[in-house]
Interface confidence: medium
């Protein structure tokens, strides 16, 4: 049971994470214009990865498009990537993930097979939530550098402060929700690593424990649903079942009624 | 090119109201505040108050509130003002402005209103 | 309300003068001031913006400074078309406040 709630609660921890990395990186609001001693008739200007934007003092926005690719720093193409590649790996994690869900059942899918999964979606999470983490933190950091710059330069000159005032940028609300969704996705993803654990079959072999009763012999696996039914011979303590023990969460191989609940 | 094109002269009496008209060509009419600003005959420039065509959003001087009633029709791009209550000392040329930033970058010509018993 | 104070009131100099006209606000406005001219019977024009900044079509003769509380406009090299009544105002905060103005005039 607990490690269905581990494996549930990773995948929708980790797809709150994901739809956070979608949403920040659609988001126009990852750098935003320093607002101090602004004037109230001010511009306010704020930037995305895709476009950036300019709201009126009115309140009318307008948004242009950054048609232009080479034109571009390398920085915040190196953003985009880090955040494409987080959400393509978010996106195939969670695909995988679905399948791997102990409460969903795909014909006679081994728990083995299951484990596996929900490895490979925990580590594309992993993954996924550290790309996410490491491109807004590029980003962070190369708005912490400028803003410093832009505020040496406005006083430095001859008589004090330069006269053409930089705009200067700081954080928008998409770098908190990049760094929140981040780190969603990664925990969901340790969440559903940790779940793998409890899923993955363990290597140690039950033996059998023989009942002699009228001249054959039924061997019964402790907590399990084989049973080997032999005659004559078969009185010795054998290995009935070699497959590797399943854990008590286990679920028949074959339907039951508590399949599809 | 933008333009802001004002209403006629006004001659009114002491007592009534008044209300001219700027319309807005060359820009988006939503987009920028239209400024109002009052210029009495040979002396400095006085703010008035501001309407947001965007909102619907009116900000008076506090010397002018109760005074001046600022609107607008977007559909004709228009803004108007409205001064209630005349004496000689509304007598002024009253311009509208379109401000960018701080600065008004493009003035109407001006509506000369006269009060005069 | 910030209060404008421009001075001299009235300026007479000859051409080819440099004339500087200044603008003391009560209270911090950083560089959010503009200054402009106005001909008798005219509307008044956009010179400087952003303390500093010439406005597009502006002859480079003039020219602003000053943030905070303090700024000037300067004009190099008096022109016959530059006599005319100079307005500073800041943008700072509402309600927008205009100096008094500055009527330059010819010697």
């Known amino acids: 049971m607990a490690v269905t709630a581990c494996q549930g609660l990773g995948f929708v921890v980790s797809l709150i994470g994901i739809a956070g990395i979608i949403a920040a990186t659609c988001m126009d609001q990852w750098s935003t214009q320093d607002l101090y001693n602004n004037p109230v008739t001010a511009v306010f200007n704020y930037q995305g990865l895709w476009r950036s934007c300019v709201r009126e003092s009115s309140g009318f926005t307008e948004c242009r498009g950054y048609f232009t690719l080479l034109g571009l720093p390398a920085m915040l193409q190196a953003v985009r990537a880090l955040m494409i590649v987080g959400i393509v790996l978010g996106a195939i994690g969670l695909l995988v993930s679905i399948f791997a869900l102990k409460c969903i059942r795909i014909g006679s899918m081994e728990d083995s097979a299951k484990a596996n999964m929900t490895l490979t979606s925990g580590i594309m999470f992993i993954v996924s939530g550290l790309c996410a983490i490491a491109g807004v933190s590029v980003f962070a950091n190369m708005l912490v550098t400028n803003f410093w710059m832009s505020t040496a330069n406005m006083y430095t000159g001859m008589g004090g402060m330069v006269q053409t005032v930089q705009t200067r940028y700081t954080f928008g609300a998409a770098l908190f929700v990049g760094w929140v969704a981040g780190g969603l996705t990664l925990i969901g993803g340790v969440m559903m690593c940790i779940a793998c654990r409890g899923l993955a079959p363990e290597e140690t072999n039950y033996k059998a424990v023989s009942y002699h009763a009228s001249g054959h012999s039924v061997a019964y696996k402790p907590g399990g649903f084989k049973a080997s039914t032999g005659f004559g011979s078969n009185t010795k303590n054998k290995k009935i079942y070699d497959g590797g023990a399943r854990t008590e969460d286990e679920v028949q191989s074959y339907p039951s009624k508590h399949d599809y609940v | 090119e933008v333009q802001l094109q004002q209403s006629g002269p006004e001659l009114v009496k002491p007592g009534a109201s008044v209300k001219m008209s700027c319309k807005a060509s060359?820009?988006?009419?939503?987009?920028?505040?239209i400024h109002w600003v009052k210029q009495k005959p040979g002396q400095g420039l006085e703010w008035i108050g501001y309407f947001n065509p965007y909102n619907d959003d009116s900000k008076n001087n506090e010397k002018f509130k109760g005074k001046a009633t600022l609107t607008s029709d977007k559909s004709s791009s228009t803004a108007y003002m409205e001064i209630s209550s005349l004496t000689s000392e509304d007598s002024a040329v009253y311009y509208c402005?379109?401000?960018?930033?701080?600065?008004?970058?493009?003035w109407g010509q001006g509506t000369l209103v006269t009060v005069s018993a | 309300d910030i209060q404008m104070n421009q001075s001299p009131s009235s300026l007479s100099a000859s051409l080819g003068d440099t004339i500087t006209i200044t603008c003391h606000v009560s209270q911090n406005i950083d560089v959010w001031l503009s200054w402009y001219q106005q001909k008798p019977g005219n509307i008044p024009k956009l010179l400087i913006y952003k303390a500093s900044n010439l406005h597009t079509g502006v002859p480079s003769r003039f020219s602003g400074s000053g943030s905070g509380t303090g700024f000037t406009l300067t004009i190099s090299s008096l022109q016959p078309e530059d006599i005319a009544t100079y307005y500073c105002?800041?943008?700072?905060?509402?309600?927008?406040?205009f100096g008094a103005g500055t009527k330059l005039e010819l010697k």
């Open positions: 402005a379109k401000l960018r930033q701080e600065r008004i970058a493009y």
């Open positions: 060359g820009y988006t009419f939503t987009r920028y505040i």
């Open positions: 105002q800041q943008g700072q905060s509402y309600p927008l406040t």
